[in-house]
């Protein structure tokens, strides 16, 4: 009955503060409408990073001001989070909701630990 969600345990953000990972869910039924939410957990506090609802076969659309982008392929969602800094290092949880058709299913991943290292400032050249 429970929906399994898989995501990588660890991801290292690029020097430009971009981190990408795949969120894959084992759909118990044939969902046509799916909601994907990225949550950040820090000190047992959970906050929403971004969210998108999409129809199967269509593109994933986040809000214009979102720091996330993504693409979907079947039961797999490729997520990219941009603008990350060292202080954003933490556990990022992929949450999947099968909104339609019934029944509703909720799937929570174990989380991806994203490490972000701020780039060293370039030394002044003489």
């Amino acid at each position: 009955k429970a929906m399994h969600v898989a995501q990588p345990a660890v991801v290292l953000a690029s020097s430009r503060g971009i981190a990408s990972f795949v969120c894959e869910y084992a759909s118990p039924g044939k969902a046509t409408e799916v909601r994907v939410t990225v949550l950040r957990q820090a000190d047992s506090q959970v906050t929403e990073v971004c969210a998108a609802t999409y129809m199967m076969g269509n593109e994933l659309t986040f809000l214009d001001d979102s720091i996330c982008t993504g693409t979907s392929s079947g039961n797999q969602v490729n997520l990219t989070i941009q603008g990350l800094r060292a202080m954003d290092t933490g556990l990022y949880i992929c949450k999947v909701e099968l909104m339609y058709p019934p029944p509703y299913y909720l799937g929570i991943g174990n989380g991806t630990q994203i490490y972000v290292i701020d780039p060293e400032p370039c030394p002044d050249s003489d």
Epitope: K1, A2, R35, V46, E48, K95, P103, Y104, Y105, L106
Partner: antibody, heavy 118, light 108 residues
Framework: QVQLVESGGGVVQPGRSLRLSCAAS????????MHWVRQAPGKGLEWVTF????????YYADSVKGRFTISRDNSKNTLYLQMNSLRAEDTAIYYC???????????WGQGTLVTVSS | EIVLTQSPGTLSLSPGERATLSCRAS???????LAWYQQKPGQAPRLLIY???SRATGIPDRFSGSGSGTDFTLTISRLEPEDFAVYYC?????????FGQGTKVEIK
């Protein structure tokens, strides 16, 4: 702080209608799915209905399907429950509840009592 | 529909004692989708445990949850006077959302 305040309960005759409201404050209402849960006098908790973020998707318990309608107005931060064709067995305290980020019902209103009696 | 059965129906204990409440599901529930609530007379339910073993904000550490699959347990290590109440388990992994019938923890 998060607050959910129900209103609209009262005494109503069988077969009549009633509309409950739940005013939400202290959080971004449109970012959360919501539920109504009821509790008959001296009994346990019974889930009644669910509504998605934008109100597009709704789910109902078999006991109320076709009689109750859940809706929301995100511009007013308010959740509603329209109850038609009320029966004596619908007598209960009705609670609105917020779905937490990880799925459980993390905040509940204080409840509003609905009594269906002739 | 996932049916949750709680036992015992009533637990009579004294303050300071350990309380062990059981919740059994009719089919497997992922541990991420099992919650426990506390309800006192005249009050709304309060979330205690989610994800089978994570304590909600502000819940004292004498409350702990465990279990997986179909068998889950809520343990109160040392009962305080304010812990005497009714406790409900709930699954939230799929619709319809379901609750157990409750366990009343009363003063012996």
């Amino acid at each position: 702080q998060v607050q959910l305040v129900e209103s609209g309960g009262g005494v109503v005759q069988p077969g009549r209608s009633l509309r409950l409201s739940c005013a939400a404050s202290g959080f971004t209402f449109s970012h959360y799915t919501m539920h109504w849960v009821r509790q008959a006098p001296g009994k346990g908790l019974e889930w009644v209905t669910f509504i998605s973020y934008d109100g597009h998707n709704k789910y109902y318990a078999d006991s109320v399907k076709g009689r109750f309608t859940i809706s929301r107005d995100n511009s007013k931060n308010t959740l509603y429950l329209q109850m038609n064709s009320l029966r004596a067995e619908d007598t209960a305290i009705y609670y609105c509840a917020r779905t937490g980020w990880l799925g459980p019902f993390d905040y509940w209103g204080q409840g509003t009592l609905v009594t269906v009696s002739s | 529909e996932i049916v949750l059965t709680q036992s015992p129906g009533t637990l009579s204990l004294s303050p300071g004692e350990r309380a062990t409440l059981s919740c059994r599901a009719s089919q497997s529930v992922g541990s991420s989708y099992l919650a426990w609530y506390q309800q006192k007379p005249g009050q709304a339910p309060r979330l205690l445990i989610y994800g089978a073993f994570s304590r909600a904000t502000g819940i004292p550490d004498r409350f702990s949850g465990s279990g997986s699959g179909t068998d889950f347990t809520l343990t109160i290590s040392r009962l305080e006077p304010e812990d005497f109440a009714v406790y409900y388990c709930q699954q939230y992994g799929s619709s319809p959302w379901t609750f157990g019938q409750g366990t009343k923890v009363e003063i012996k």
